[in-house]
């Protein structure tokens, strides 16, 4: 899915209002320095691509995130604010329902959610330049200038 045409500010609002709190709940009791952040993103569409991948794609050692509250709210936000997103997810959702039987919090899942927090932080506060400024470092953001 190409996240270029999402309403980034509405997704940001959904994150700050609810999703972030669910991520904090999931990570409660974990030190912020416990995991090294190895996943990064360069602009808002790229951040959403990485967020979708980490949230919904099963990985070795962590196959259960899609059923978490933050994941369901993420899915809802993307479905509402990214045109055509929900249609692309129908097959993936059916596959997830078959794959996930129970919610298990593993250390690998905690590490993955720590990565997610970093991606969301980057998505929310990209260092966009002032209007009228021409010193963009990132061409993708040049065409999607949503102020924080």
């Amino acid at each position: 899915y190409d996240f270029t045409n999402c309403d980034f500010e509405k997704i940001k609002a959904a994150y700050l209002s609810t999703i972030s709190k669910d991520l904090i709940t999931y990570m409660s009791g974990t030190k912020s320095t416990e995991f090294n952040n190895t996943v990064s993103c360069s602009n808002r569409p790229h951040c959403l691509t990485e967020i979708q991948s980490l949230t919904f794609n099963p990985t070795a050692g962590c196959a259960s995130l899609a059923k978490e509250m933050f994941a369901m709210k993420t899915k809802a936000a993307l479905a509402i604010w990214c045109p055509g997103y929900s249609e692309t997810q129908i097959n993936a959702t059916q596959a997830m329902k078959k794959a996930r039987k129970s919610k298990v919090t593993t250390n690998k899942c905690l590490e993955q959610v720590s990565q997610l927090q970093g991606l969301w932080r980057r998505f929310n506060r990209p260092l966009l330049k002032q209007q009228g400024s021409s010193d963009y470092k990132d061409d993708d953001d040049k065409h999607h200038h949503h102020h924080h």
Epitope: E9, K10, K12, A13, Y15, L16, S17, S20, S32, T33, F35, N36, N37, S40, S42, Q117, G118, W120, R121, R122, F123, N124, R125, L127, L128, K129, Q130, K137, D138, H147, H148
Partner: antibody, heavy 120, light 111 residues
Framework: EVQLVQSGAEVKKPGSSVKVSCKAS????????MHWVKHAPGQGLEWIGA????????SYNQKFKDRATLTVDKSTSTAYMELSSLRSEDTAVYYC?????????????WGQGTTVTVSS | DIVMTQSPDSLAVSLGERATINCRAS??????????MHWYQQKPGQPPKLLIY???NLGSGVPDRFSGSGSGTDFTLTISSLQAEDVAVYYC?????????FGQGTKLEIK
């Protein structure tokens, strides 16, 4: 403990440059926007700019864009602000600050400040 | 640039009384239903400390005598019962649009 430790006070001549450092510890430096703020005597706070250590991307207040340069050294978790062509109006306390955990945009951790005095 | 104007510039309030500081933005700092306005407290020789984020949310470890309200262009910081340790300069800050801008500051003293 999450903290930012800045370099010591500097006295500089007009026309020269100063480079202030800000060493981060207790958090994953590369994933937080780092900001610089000026506080001149008897004045309010003024945002200079910000840098994302993950890729070195910067955003500047146009007022400082020509004279301020923000850089980072990820290997030492240190942010730098260099100010060139110094003049008396640059006499101030300069703070580095970390943006919050969640992308709210507030500054939740501040350095102790570095006093820069520009005098002939 | 969004200009933040605080009023009053200075304020003297008796201990235990209510203190109110206003901040007006030259244009709205709201986005998608959220107000991107923060309040800081700065004491002499110290860096600023976050008090209120996003107009009305209390910062971590901040006493509940502090509160914030407002949306759009008009915002208020209230201290319900002034304590001696609240003597400081208070700043509002908008982060909705670059460049990030602060108010000129309000100096709060004890009457």
């Amino acid at each position: 403990e999450v903290q930012l430790v800045q370099s010591g006070a500097e006295v500089k001549k007009p026309g020269s440059s100063v480079k202030v450092s800000c060493k981060a510890s207790g958090f994953t430096f590369s994933t937080y926007n780092m900001h610089w703020v000026k506080h001149a005597p008897g004045q309010g706070l003024e945002w200079i700019g910000a840098i994302y250590p993950g890729n070195g991307e910067t955003s500047y207040n146009q007022k400082f864009k020509d004279r301020a340069t923000l850089t980072v050294d990820k290997s030492t978790s240190t942010a730098y602000m260099e100010l060139s062509s110094l003049r008396s109006e640059d006499t101030a306390v300069y703070y580095c600050a970390r943006e919050d955990d969640y992308g709210e945009g507030y500054f939740d951790v501040w350095g102790q400040g570095t006093t820069v005095t520009v005098s002939s | 640039d969004i200009v933040m104007t605080q009023s009053p510039d200075s304020l003297a309030v008796s201990l235990g009384e209510r203190a109110t500081i206003n901040c007006r933005a030259s244009e709205s700092v709201d986005n998608s239903g959220l107000s991107f306005m923060h309040w800081y407290q700065q004491k002499p020789g110290q860096p600023p400390k976050l008090l209120i984020y996003r107009a009305s949310n209390l910062g971590s470890g901040v006493p509940d005598r502090f509160s914030g309200s407002g949306s759009g262009t008009d915002f208020t910081l209230t201290i319900s019962s002034l304590q001696a340790e609240d003597v400081a300069v208070y700043y509002c800050q908008q982060i909705n649009t670059d460049p990030l801008t602060f108010g000129q500051g309000t100096k709060l003293e004890i009457k």
